[in-house]
Interface confidence: medium
């Protein structure tokens, strides 16, 4: 069964900067990736970025840069303009879609006791799975 992993890390040099890393583990080619925060896409979450392997990317504040790392993984840099660092307690979700086979989504957040620059292990927490 395909799985999605999500990692959230705080940048060591800038405590107001976060990076979300997401990856797809499974067969098939990915045709669209959606990153949201505050919950799963379409279930209370707010879109931060949409990435297409050929058509490019779209992103919305506070997303700073969305990019493909490999054919099946992406990263999204976030700029936290507020002093209170709301990202620390936020859930980030990544949905990988392979049209028209299905889509798979998992969520993750910054570990409570994370040291800046250290990332959490990629623990997949499936939210939605294709039938």
């Amino acid at each position: 069964t395909p799985e999605v992993w999500v990692q959230v890390q705080m940048e060591a040099t800038e405590l107001s900067s976060f990076t979300v890393h997401c990856g797809f583990l499974g067969p098939g080619s990915i045709s669209l990736v959606t990153v949201s925060w505050g919950g799963p896409d379409g279930a209370g979450g707010t879109k931060l970025a949409v990435l297409h392997p050929e058509l490019g990317t779209r992103q919305w504040a506070p997303a700073r840069q969305a990019r493909w790392e490999t054919q099946s993984s992406i990263s999204l840099a976030l700029e936290d303009s507020g002093a209170s660092s709301p990202f620390a307690n936020t859930t980030f979700c990544c949905k990988f879609a392979s049209f028209p086979e299905g889509s798979w989504e998992s969520c993750g957040s910054l570990p409570p006791s994370s040291d800046p620059g250290l990332s959490a292990p990629p623990t997949p927490v499936p939210i939605l799975r294709a039938d």
Epitope: G42, A97, F99, P100, E101, G102, A130
Partner: antibody
């Protein structure tokens, strides 16, 4: 201007075959997945075939699997639907539609349709 | 495959009236779309990804929902809105449509 124009429909006997075409213009055809969707006389919509932009992957519901074949010629900007072993329940208006990636694969443009009647 | 049930099957509304129609899915849906079809015409995309308005669609149309329950709302009915409305899902293949809600002008 995006345009999809279907052709090839007509009257055919049960067990017969028919090949539909959809001529695309106004966009980069090879960048988009495409589908054939039919509308029955009862006005129900049913997706009968989907093909990815490169033409390698094809998908069919069980109702037409093994009888219908979708293909595309990206050089000619044309989508095809080969239908065989036709049944009376295949009688419908057949539309081709484009899937827009950034609209989450919604079918954002449809052709005007071509009518297929299967009757003896 | 996912079955979509639209209700009501037929409804009528007066100009200026608020209209809401629903689409219920047999299991959780990843992506929901709404289309409008008028007699003699092809379906036209209204809403994609549950709540986003397609290009050229009047802002009186809105979509909402999640999981298995979705709805399409017209804030103020206009004569040109008389049509049949279809919901469609993509979660996994096959793509499926609801049977439609026919909206008539009262």
């Amino acid at each position: 201007e995006v345009q999809l124009v279907e052709s090839g429909g007509g009257l055919v006997k049960p067990g017969g075959s028919l090949k539909l075409s959809c001529a695309a213009s106004g966009f980069t055809f090879s960048s988009f997945a495409m589908s054939w969707v039919r509308q029955t006389p009862a006005k129900r919509l049913e997706s009968v075939a989907t093909i990815n932009n490169g033409g390698i992957n094809t998908y069919y519901p069980d109702t037409v699997k093994g009888r219908f074949t979708v293909s595309r010629d990206n050089a000619k900007n044309t989508l095809y639907l080969q239908m065989s072993s036709l049944r009376s329940e295949d009688t419908a208006m057949y539309y081709c539609a484009r899937h827009d990636d950034f609209l989450y694969y919604a079918m954002d443009y449809w052709g005007q349709g071509t009518s297929v009647t299967v009757s003896s | 495959q996912i079955v979509l049930t639209q209700s009501p099957a037929i409804m009528s509304a007066s100009p200026g009236e608020k209209v809401t129609m629903t689409c219920s899915a047999s299991s959780s849906v990843s992506y929901m779309y709404w289309y409008q079809q008028k007699p003699g015409s092809s379906p036209r995309l209204l809403i994609y990804d549950t709540s986003n308005l397609a290009s050229g669609v009047p802002v009186r149309f809105s979509g909402s929902g999640s999981g298995t329950s979705y709805s399409l709302t017209i804030s103020r009915m206009e004569a040109e809105d008389a049509a049949t409305y279809y919901c469609q899902q993509w979660t996994s293949y096959p793509l499926t449509f609801g049977a439609g809600t026919k909206l008539e002008l009262k």
